[in-house]
């Protein structure tokens, strides 16, 4: 569909089928109205996933879609829903006539807005591209982290933008480790952020035309050490058929790098624990945090054999966590069951006695067993 | 259409220097930043290095810093990649890529060239 | 760096099924999460960007969520060209790390 002076659905009634994927081709410059559903019951139009303001040069108002000017930023796919049941009333992908990458949905204005462009465009002052981007106004954050501000912008001419610590020109060169300033992506990036990195941190973005600004807070957390953190609940109770496969879940917060061990406790001569009261256990699988799946424990095809008591142990430098779960399977024929399994066990500590030897990363652990 | 095209691949002994370069064409190259991902036989992706449109921005993986370059010329649409001090491990397939504008994904990538280190 | 960590590392599943990839991140990184979609011998193709915005002309069946440090992709009803391998890319950090990938094969 080739647009003229006007791109324009009219009028606002619910569209038929083919209405409803579209592509329309729109010249730079050119006011767009596209229109969906009853005015009074118009849908809500959407943009990469953001709900349209009623206001503003881009806006979603009573099932119209208005755009005074379209520019190369503005071409993208668009979603009218209906209130309500979120039913997809239109789906259209608007395109810029003469970009030479017309498919992408978020271009960059700035080549369309250089004096030595072809085009020419009224001048008009810096606006946010993406707001929604910069919602999170406070950043907390604990000490060694990455942190990263945007201010997403354009305007004609493209505006310039820089960045400002506490009121005072941020440049990074008294950080350790600097900071990465990104103009095309209108971010400031700093790495293994300290103390003293806090502060209020505010991005000018300024033409001929007009500025604005915004600031971001930034708080950094000093990290107190302390043992892995196991999501509370986490192995659950499962109860599986036989033949079925089942999977484990055990989340871990640690700041330290932790370990993660899947044991199963067993049953030797006929006893769940040793002479000296500890239980035998049989690791299952061992990896640190970083490895693929190590906090899912998967069993495949249960049997009978597989039931029992399963233990999530989570270490780090500076203490162990752990929390258990049962596994009950049940005979295939039988279909329904509505016994309780027992509760998990949330303990502090632990030690086990095991038959294949725990790994060297808990050996230098002292670890004690609580009922 | 956009395309990305990469070449300079080969076989290198440990030591040695490579020099990989991308031809683009389709889209208004000073616009974007520019990528290289690479991909050793049977593993996974591994970001290499990136620059931005007009060449005022650099950065590159831990493990190829202080090797490796990236640099384009915008008057030729090309990307390029000085790999020196090439080891064993950097043996894989060279991708090219594009990145979204205001974003950090690679919507366009080449076909790949694939560079061998060994004795 | 910033650490990605996809789970599984490989799953079988069949046509029509609904299939859920997870990338945890060590470490909050906003929405900066992308999803590609890589066939043998192929460039990896860009599926999802910015954790759940859809790449023009992939089909609606992939979609993305999450943000922070847990993400997850979605196919609602897979078919027999999506048998391949998904990475998850953070470009939260300069630098821009990618997960290990999860190889969606046919049971």
């Known amino acids: 569909l080739e647009a003229s002076e006007e791109v324009e659905l009219e009028p606002c009634l619910a569209p038929s089928l083919e209405q409803q994927e579209q592509e329309l081709t729109v010249a730079l410059g050119q006011p767009v109205r596209l229109c969906c559903g009853r005015a009074e019951r118009g849908g809500h139009w959407y943009k990469e996933g953001s709900r349209l303001a009623p206001a503003g040069r881009v806006r979603g108002w009573r099932g119209r879609l208005e755009i005074a000017s379209f520019l190369p930023e503005d071409a993208g796919r668009y979603l009218c829903l209906a209130r309500g049941s979120m039913i997809v009333l239109q789906n259209l992908t608007l395109i810029t006539g003469d970009s030479l990458t017309s498919s992408n949905d978020d271009e960059d204005p700035k080549s369309h807005r250089d004096p030595s462009n072809r085009h020419s465009y009224p001048q008009q002052a810096p606006y946010w591209t993406h707001p929604q981007r910069m919602e999170k106004k406070l950043h907390a954050v604990p000490a060694g982290n990455t942190v990263k501000f945007r201010c997403p912008a354009a305007g004609n001419p493209t505006p310039t933008i820089r960045w400002l610590k506490d009121g005072q020109a941020f440049h990074g060169e008294n950080r350790i480790g600097g900071i990465r300033l990104r103009h095309q992506h209108w971010s400031l990036v700093m790495e293994s952020v300290v103390p003293s990195d806090r502060g209020t941190y505010t991005c000018l973005v300024e033409n001929a035309v007009g500025s604005i600004r915004y600031n971001y807070l930034l708080d950094v957390l000093e990290r107190s050490p302390h043992r892995p953190i196991l999501q509370a609940g986490l192995p659950a109770n499962t109860t599986a058929v036989v033949g079925s496969d089942v999977e484990l879940l055990c989340k871990v917060y640690s700041d330290a790098q932790p370990h993660i061990q899947w044991l199963k406790h067993i049953v030797i001569n006929g006893s769940s624990f040793g002479a000296d009261g500890f239980p035998y256990v049989q690791v299952l699988k061992t990896a640190d945090i970083n490895s693929s799946e190590v906090e899912v424990l998967y069993l495949r095809n249960v049997s009978a054999e597989d039931a029992g008591e399963y233990t999530c142990l989570a270490g780090n430098s500076i203490g162990l966590s752990y929390q258990s779960a049962w596994l009950t399977v049940l005979p295939e024929e039988d279909p329904t069951w509505t016994a309780a399994a027992p509760e998990a066990r949330y303990t502090d500590k632990l030690e086990f006695r095991h038959d294949s030897g725990l790994n060297d990363i808990f050996e230098a652990q002292k670890i004690e067993w609580h009922e | 259409q956009v395309q990305l095209l990469e070449s300079g691949g080969g076989l290198v002994q440990p030591g040695g220097s490579l020099r990989l370069s991308c031809a683009a064409s389709g889209f208004t190259f000073s616009d974007y930043a520019m990528s290289w991902v690479r991909q050793a036989p049977g593993k996974g992706l591994e970001w290499v290095s990136v620059?931005?449109?007009?060449?005022?921005?650099?950065h590159y993986a831990d493990s190829v810093k202080g090797r490796f370059t990236i640099s384009r010329d915008n008057s030729k649409n090309t990307l390029y990649l000085q790999m020196n001090s090439l080891r064993a491990e950097d043996t894989a397939v060279y991708y090219c890529?594009?990145?979204?504008?205001?974003?950090?994904?690679?919507?366009?990538w080449g076909q790949g060239t694939l560079v061998t280190v060994s004795s | 760096d910033i650490q990605m960590t996809q789970s599984p590392s490989s799953l079988s599943a069949s046509v029509g099924d609904r299939v859920t990839i997870t990338c945890r991140a060590s470490?909050?990184?906003?929405?900066?999460l992308n999803w590609y979609q890589q066939k043998p011998g192929k460039a990896p193709k860009l599926l999802i960007y910015?954790?759940?915005n859809l790449q023009s002309g992939v089909p609606s069946r992939f979609s993305g969520s999450g943000s922070g440090t847990d993400f997850t992709l979605t196919i609602s009803s897979l078919q027999p060209e999506d048998f391949a391998v998904y990475y998850c890319?953070?470009?939260?950090?300069?630098?821009?790390?990618f997960g290990q990938g999860t190889k969606v094969e046919i049971k």
């Open positions: 470490q909050d990184i906003s929405s900066d």
């Open positions: 890529a594009r990145e979204k504008t205001y974003s950090s994904a690679f919507d366009y």
């Open positions: 890319q953070q470009h939260y950090s300069p630098s821009h790390t």
């Open positions: 910015d954790a759940s």
């Open positions: 620059i931005e449109g007009d060449g005022s921005y650099t």
